[in-house]
């Protein structure tokens, strides 16, 4: 009789996670009588996967009926494969005994598990930055196998080149993770811009996964300030306008100062958006010049998105306007009513748009 051989015809088998794997094994002889066992790995630490004679292996079934007369096919079927199942599987013939004695092992079949990467998650900087600054975006995807993977970055459809990518771990593993950091230079026009991280892997059949981040979360566009005086009104009132333009995000506080004293504070809300995603805001102040003996220094102070305040000042020349007799009041135009106060303190009422 020929000497028994244990034949594992496939050197390697690749299976998608969630699918089933068939590991083939045949023996060339009915002799010696004894069970087949399947192990993952070799040596003393090998893991028992299937024992023909005993044990409960809920995910493993024998492909052929083990009770079949003169059975020499000991192939197994492993269901619901996960990346943790990856490894080299050995079909090992034992001689019946107490205990059974190992006779011969097959050459082994390497099971690799194709696992899809998780949806890429893109995270931006913790704090906003202004135009011309460089910000970093990070893209992470996990749980894929095999290790080979391609990651690309795009900004508004244009591929980026300034990024660094790492796949971990460096050695063999059941599954891998990728982390990439891209550096993006911001421009004032980036409020509506988007960065895209695109991951391509053998398991995705040419349909890459994408993760996105909006630059609106990362950018701050500081406002331009312009303070102007509108035409003089008949009742000695000057209309001073503070135009705050091209800012993002909307979080903005505007304070009017008259000769250094706070006159009014306003918060921006529900502003219409410009085409480029920025916002404009106009605030105006009516100053009754007849109430002032000297020139009035008006300051428009803007605090944008928690940044240090930006000021723009404007002097209203009182000497240029004839003073109304008997009036010591600077009044706000609230429509039709002007109110007189008999005390010496100036009371200022203001209206804004």
């Amino acid at each position: 009789e020929e000497e028994l051989q244990v034949i594992q015809p496939e050197k390697s088998v690749s299976v998608a996670a969630g699918d089933s794997a068939t590991l083939n094994c045949t023996v060339t002889s009915l002799i010696p009588v004894g069970p087949i066992q399947w192990f993952r790995g070799a040596g003393p630490g090998r893991e028992l996967i299937y024992h023909q004679k005993e044990g409960h292996f809920p995910r493993v079934t024998s492909v052929s009926e083990s009770t079949k007369r003169n059975n020499m096919d000991f192939s197994i079927h492993i269901s619901n494969i996960t990346p943790a199942d990856a490894g080299t599987y050995y079909c090992v013939k034992f001689r019946k005994g107490s205990p059974d004695v190992e006779v011969k092992s097959g050459a082994g079949t390497e099971l690799s598990v194709r696992a899809k990467p998780s949806a890429p998650v893109v995270s931006g900087p913790a704090v906003r930055a202004t135009a011309e600054h460089t910000v970093s975006f990070t893209c992470e995807s996990h749980g894929f196998s095999p290790r080979d993977i391609t990651l690309k970055w795009f900004k508004n459809g244009n591929e980026l080149s300034d990024f660094q990518t790492n796949v971990d771990p460096a050695g063999k593993s059941v599954s891998y993770s990728i982390r990439s950091t891209a550096r993006v230079v911001l421009t004032r026009r980036d409020v509506h811009s988007q960065v895209i991280c695109e991951v391509a892997h053998v398991t995705l059949q040419g349909d890459p996964l994408r993760g996105t981040a909006n630059l609106s979360e990362a950018i701050r566009v500081p406002p331009f300030l312009e303070v102007t005086q509108q035409s003089m009104r008949a009742d000695n009132q000057v209309n001073v306008t503070c135009q705050v333009t091209k800012f993002y995000p909307q979080r903005l506080q505007l304070t009017w100062l008259e000769n250094g004293n706070v006159s009014r504070t306003e918060m921006a809300s529900a502003l219409p958006e410009n085409k480029d995603g920025t916002y404009n805001w106009t605030s105006w102040l009516l100053v009754n010049v007849s109430a002032h003996r000297d020139d009035v220094k008006l300051t428009c102070q803007v605090e944008h998105d928690g940044q240090p305040a930006v000021n723009k000042s404007f002097s209203v020349k009182v000497s240029a306007h004839p003073k109304e007799q008997g009036s010591n009041t600077a009044a706000e135009n609230t429509g039709t009513n002007e109110r007189d106060y008999k005390d010496d303190d100036d009371k200022h009422h203001h209206h804004h748009h």
Partner: antibody
Framework: QVQLVQSGAEVKKPGASVKVSCKAS????????INWVRQAPGQGLEWIAM????????HYNQIFKDRATLTTDTSTSTAYMELRSLRSDDTAVYYC????????????WGRGTLVTVSS | DIVLTQSPDSLAVSLGERATINCRAS??????????IFWYQQKPGQPPKLLIY???NLDSGVPDRFSGSGSGTDFTLTISSLQAEDVAVYYC????????FGQGTKLEIK
Amino acid sequence: QVQLVQSGAEVKKPGASVKVSCKASGYTFTNYWINWVRQAPGQGLEWIAMIDPSDSETHYNQIFKDRATLTTDTSTSTAYMELRSLRSDDTAVYYCAMDYGSLYAMDYWGRGTLVTVSS
Amino acid sequence: DIVLTQSPDSLAVSLGERATINCRASKSVSSSGYNYIFWYQQKPGQPPKLLIYLASNLDSGVPDRFSGSGSGTDFTLTISSLQAEDVAVYYCQHSRDLPTFGQGTKLEIK
């Protein structure tokens, strides 16, 4: 290790039936055939039948085909052999035996159940 | 059905001597290069014990003084040096198709 534990001795009247049990342990019950063999006092071995517990496939010796029925209960890893219409010449020790190599041989045996048929 | 005939029916051999038991099949029990003959030993009050499978292969734990040979229709069980504990009845069995046993050979010490 493999063990086959059989039910106790039975005394039956002619024409009655007997059901002998064989509880298996130490191996996966559904992976190996169970054979039934009998031995009349002072006589040789006589093969009765065999059953595959995984799917209840059976093969019978023609002599016993009409009187013997083999069954299994996989939940308790127990095989049964029922013999009907007993006659005095059915008096024998009835053995169950496990076929380890799927060669239709008998590798491990129970200790036997004596069935006495007497009026 | 294949009929197995053992010879002799009984045999007395001196301790340390060779004992030979024959088994003849009514037709060939060979298939696919294997000879489907098995040998069992049965001591009084005990179930049979498998000694040899597929004509010539010693079962686990069986002393190597036992050996089997033969092919086709003629097979032999040999005990090279008889020991006192070898006193028993020996049966051959085939499984070329459904199993049958030989009638048995009683081995005693001379």
